[in-house]
């Protein structure tokens, strides 16, 4: 007896983080034997959508012409072949930006920092939010979360970095999010350029958790140290 059908591959184009009002296409790729594709969205009646396969039948397209809050969430897809339904795909998390006004990102004491010293990136929102995310441009795994505990909302989150090395240099943005849905993010903050001086042959800071050895310097998540600020926010690594 044949084993279970292989799970399909699920992805989004142009990406899984989409600004409000922009279009996005979700693709589900199975096998050439697929007769039908089904897309399920978490916490929505299943199936969320069904599509016939596109020739040569190994994938289907699910189109979202204009991104809104309703489309943000966690998706899985399946395909049906003559022998039945496949295993579910790995989940796709479709995130919408533009749900809230942009926060303000600043560096303390300054965005010009000497290698080996400390700097804190401060993401501030004029209204209370419960999650703050720090993004580094061109990093493969750029998300650093600070989420408030017990639903207590905060106006800011601090992202301390120490000791700073050349790897920390670059362009950062932050986002904020409300408890309504963690798939809904604010507009991005204006960019902040962190400039690290005197950084020849800096040693890398030792990571606070193991990271794949295949990752290059720009693929490493940020490694701030020190305690989480008194704001009641808890650190989460993505």
């Amino acid at each position: 007896q044949a084993g279970p059908l292989p799970k399909p591959t699920l992805w989004a184009e142009p990406g899984s983080v989409i600004s409000w009002g922009n279009s996005v296409t979700i693709w589900c790729q199975g096998t050439l034997e697929a007769r039908e594709y089904r897309l399920d969205k978490e916490e929505s009646p299943a199936p969320w959508d069904r599509q016939n396969p596109l020739e040569p039948k190994n994938k289907a397209r699910f189109s979202i012409p204009s991104m809104t809050e309703d489309y943000a969430g966690r998706y899985r897809c399946y395909y049906r072949s003559p022998v039945g339904w496949s295993q579910p795909s790995d989940p796709l998390e479709l995130v919408m930006t533009g749900a809230y006004s942009k926060p303000t990102l600043s560096a303390l004491p300054s965005p010009l920092v000497t290698s080996g010293k400390s700097v804190t990136l401060l993401c501030q929102s004029r209204s209370p939010m419960d999650t703050f995310l720090l993004i580094k441009e061109r990093a493969a795994h750029p998300l650093l979360h600070l989420r408030s505990e017990h639903g207590a909302q905060q106006h800011q989150a601090e992202f301390p970095m120490s000791p700073v090395t050349s790897v920390h240099g670059g362009t950062y943005r932050c986002f904020s999010s409300h408890g309504f849905s963690h798939y809904l993010l604010s507009h991005p903050s204006d960019p902040l350029e962190l400039i690290v001086s005197g950084s020849l042959e800096d040693p890398r800071p030792s990571p606070t958790r193991s990271v794949s050895t295949a990752a290059g310097p720009e693929d490493q998540p940020l490694m701030p140290t020190g305690s989480v600020p008194h704001s009641g926010l808890r650190r989460h690594w993505e």
Partner: antibody, heavy 120, light 110 residues
């Protein structure tokens, strides 16, 4: 020209309702701003009524004294903000302003104001 | 709640005087404080934001200082056009606020 223009003020009887409009031009209400309604009773200071976030969710916050009598909404297609006022009282007589919160968290753009008079 | 307390409520001064207005927040607002000038029958005009940054087109005789809970607006040499009412405002928006403005300071001719 970047501006906010209020309209809809006038004379209303106690207990009545009124809807004020705030039309934005030169910028989009759906871009990254908060917009607030602020009022000023004759001879008195500025009083914050509430604010709406221009993000797609449109979060609103109100001053504690509002207690559900006023509602802020918006119509992005018309680039217009609204203040619905119910159960009006004589003490609601004031000039009503809409104002935009800039990136600096300050109110960097104000409308000219519209006068609401609550009297029998 | 964050309460903004302005003092004095009225200030009598002459042209050329140095004038200082104080705004006190009931809890830290960091540097998220703005100052406005308002003349009778007109909308308020932004003078200073983030406690000490001069808004575009505002004369350099106006300056702001402070952080946390204590802030001041200073007019180094009062001009005839400066007789007006001044308000401070904190930048936070949330549902537990009575007001975001101070009570105002009227600067009048002595």
């Amino acid at each position: 020209e970047v501006q906010l223009v209020e309209s809809g003020g006038g004379l209303v009887q106690p207990g009545g309702s009124l809807r004020l409009s705030c039309a934005a031009s030169g910028f989009s209400l759906s871009s990254s701003y908060w917009i607030s309604w602020v009022r000023q009773a004759p001879g008195k200071g500025l009083e914050w009524i509430g604010s709406i976030d221009s993000g797609s969710v449109g979060i609103t916050y109100y001053a504690t004294w509002v207690k559900g009598r006023f509602t802020i909404s918006r119509d992005n297609s018309k680039n217009t903000l609204y203040l619905q006022m119910n159960s009006l009282r004589a003490e609601d007589t004031a000039v009503y302003y809409c104002a935009r919160h800039g990136d600096n968290w300050a109110l960097d753009l104000w409308g000219q104001g519209t006068l609401v008079t609550v009297s029998s | 709640d964050i309460q903004m307390t302005q003092s004095p409520s009225t200030l009598s001064a002459s042209v050329g005087d140095r004038v200082t207005i104080t705004c006190r927040a009931s809890q830290s607002i960091q540097s998220w404080l703005a100052w406005y000038q308002q003349k009778p029958g007109k909308a308020p005009k932004l003078l200073i934001y983030k406690a000490s940054t001069l808004a575009s087109g505002v004369p350099s005789r106006f300056s702001g200082s402070g952080s946390g809970t204590e802030f001041t607006l200073t007019i180094s040499s009062l001009q005839p056009d400066d007789f007006a009412t001044y308000y401070c405002q904190h930048g936070y928006i949330r549902g537990d606020l009575d007001n975001v403005f101070g009570g105002g300071t009227k600067v009048e001719i002595k």
